[in-house]
Interface confidence: medium
């Protein structure tokens, strides 16, 4: 059976293989791949050795050991959900079935981010979350895995949740760029936006003034400018579809203490709809 | 310590032969890649090539391929640069130096004190 | 083969100042870079390695970035010892490639 190794969502794993060279330097090749060792080789493989150098990875795949002194640790940068499964090391020894093979179980965890209080209109939407780090290199593109369900009315704590999250360290500490895209389940805005449509003809009897349906906040966004996310969430939920998507959300962290978003629509307006949290 | 000394460099004529060696200490070079690196006078740095003693496998520029080789003696903890057909071109400073690796990439954190090689006539 | 220019070519600085010393690569090198200090005479010393890491014994002041294929080492503040040549390159593949060097002079 596999021994089992335990990472967070946006952490790095490492996964222990070694070996000793039959002389010093005299390398064996090793191969890792994602899925049990099979009978020859390395399924879905993620990094090779020869007898001298790595001569093939993928992006997010390294060995931080010394290889040539038989260390072939293998290290997956910045975790998400996906890359939890069962790993092949396996040390291609030359002979007829020489081959040492060692499954390795990896469990990703999801990050831990405390969700915030909820606020009194906790209008709950549960839509799902991909934060992604976009390396500089261009095989570097990464998806850090999924944000827990927050209300609609948390969106502007999201800065100082990620701040206190382990994830946002990581973050910062690489200087990466992070991207989130924003998805609304087509049923659940449905339901929304006929409790909001019933809600509103509700008050709309009592109160017999137009001026006050104008004045109603559909969602408030607590500290967003008001021509930014609330009034696309907000004209997402009167669309026909129910569905709104939120392409381009991209927080740029450059500075250690500042988050910064622009929100733009499909259409790519020429001037994208801004949002900044500053970091105290 | 860990420590690295070439020798064997001197003045050649152009289309001479010349053998550098490279002892090391405070570390055995089978399990490490030592690389050949030379400095023009009053020039930058450049790669000539590298073994891994170990397992014998070499690597070469492009300037030196077919000229210059690269061997070691693991019993003596010494590499050697046998340098033939040598141009005005190779003269330079000659440092060897040790492989560190991280990341799967050798970057160099120890060097020898170099040798001059000069080819002139 | 990967070319690597490095600029500017010489500076002048003063003791304290923050000095900066940038790289290109001529293609993806992903991490793969390291610097190096030379003084007239001596062999090289390692700085950095994969482009941002600290080698073992060498000051904080000294610190590296990378920003796509564009490298930095960063002085903080410069000290006398400082002023030398210093050389970055590329080991993501064969051959191994450097910058022509950057020459920091005392102003």
């Known amino acids: 059976s596999e021994v089992e190794y335990r990472a967070e969502v946006g952490q790095n794993a490492y996964l222990p293989c070694f070996y000793t060279p039959a002389a010093p330097g005299n390398l064996v090749p090793v191969c890792w791949g994602k899925g049990a060792c099979p009978v020859f080789e390395c399924g879905n493989v993620v990094l090779r050795t020869d007898e001298r150098d790595v001569n093939y990875w993928t992006s997010r795949y390294w060995l931080n050991g010394d290889f040539r002194k038989g260390d072939v640790s293998l290290t997956i940068e910045n975790v998400i959900l996906a890359d939890s499964g069962i790993y092949c090391c396996r040390i291609q020894i030359p002979g007829i079935m020489n081959d040492e093979k060692f499954n390795l179980k990896l469990v990703i965890k999801p990050a831990k981010v405390t969700p915030a209080p909820t606020l009194q209109r906790d209008f709950t939407a549960a839509f799902p979350r991909m934060l992604t780090t976009r390396g500089h290199g261009p095989a570097e593109t990464q998806t850090l895995g999924s944000l827990p369900d927050i209300n609609l009315t948390q969106i502007s704590t999201l800065a100082n949740e990620l701040r206190d999250s382990r994830l946002a360290n990581d973050l910062r500490d690489s200087g990466a760029t992070i991207r989130i895209g924003i998805y609304i389940g087509a049923g659940i805005c449905a339901g929304l936006a006929l409790a909001l449509i019933f809600g509103a003809l509700i008050f709309k009897w009592y109160s017999h003034s137009k001026e006050k349906i104008q004045n109603l906040s559909l969602i408030s966004l607590a500290n967003l400018p008001p021509s930014g996310l609330a009034n696309a969430v907000a004209e997402g939920i009167r669309s026909e579809e129910n569905i709104y998507t939120i392409e381009e959300n991209v927080y740029e962290v450059e500075e250690p203490n500042e988050y910064y978003c622009y929100v733009s629509s499909r259409q790519q307006p020429s001037q994208p709809l801004g949002c900044r949290f500053a970091m105290p | 310590e860990v420590q690295l000394v070439e020798s064997g460099g001197g003045l050649v004529q152009p289309g001479g032969s010349l053998r550098l060696s490279c002892a090391a200490s405070?570390?055995?070079?089978?399990?490490?890649?030592i690389h050949w690196v030379r400095q023009a006078p009053g020039k930058g740095l450049e790669w000539v090539g590298d073994?891994?003693?170990?397992?014998?496998?070499?690597d070469y520029a492009d300037s030196v391929k077919d000229r210059f080789t690269i061997s070691a003696d693991t019993s003596k903890n010494t590499a050697y640069l046998q340098m033939n057909s040598l141009r005005a071109e190779d003269t330079a400073v000659y440092y060897c130096?040790?492989?560190?690796?991280?990341?799967?990439?050798?970057?160099?954190?120890?060097w020898g004190q170099g040798t001059l090689v000069t080819v002139s006539s | 083969d990967i070319q690597m220019t490095q600029s500017p070519s010489s500076l002048s600085a003063s003791v304290g100042d923050r000095v900066t010393i940038t790289c290109r690569a001529s293609?993806?090198?992903?991490?793969?870079v390291a610097w190096y200090q030379q003084k007239p005479g001596k062999a090289p010393k390692l700085l950095i390695y994969?482009?941002?890491f600290l080698y073992s014994g060498v000051p904080s002041r000294f610190s590296g970035s990378r920003s796509g294929t564009d490298f930095t080492l960063t002085i903080s503040s410069l000290q006398p010892e400082d002023f030398a040549t210093y050389y970055c390159?590329?080991?993501?593949?064969?051959?191994?490639?450097f910058g022509q060097g950057t020459k920091v002079e005392i102003k």
């Open positions: 994969s482009a941002s």
């Open positions: 293609q993806d090198v992903n991490t793969a």
């Open positions: 405070g570390f055995n070079i089978s399990n490490n890649v």
């Open positions: 390159q590329q080991h993501y593949t064969t051959p191994p490639t």
């Open positions: 130096a040790r492989g560190y690796v991280y990341r799967m990439w050798d970057s160099y954190d120890y």
């Open positions: 073994i891994m003693p170990g397992g014998g496998s070499t």
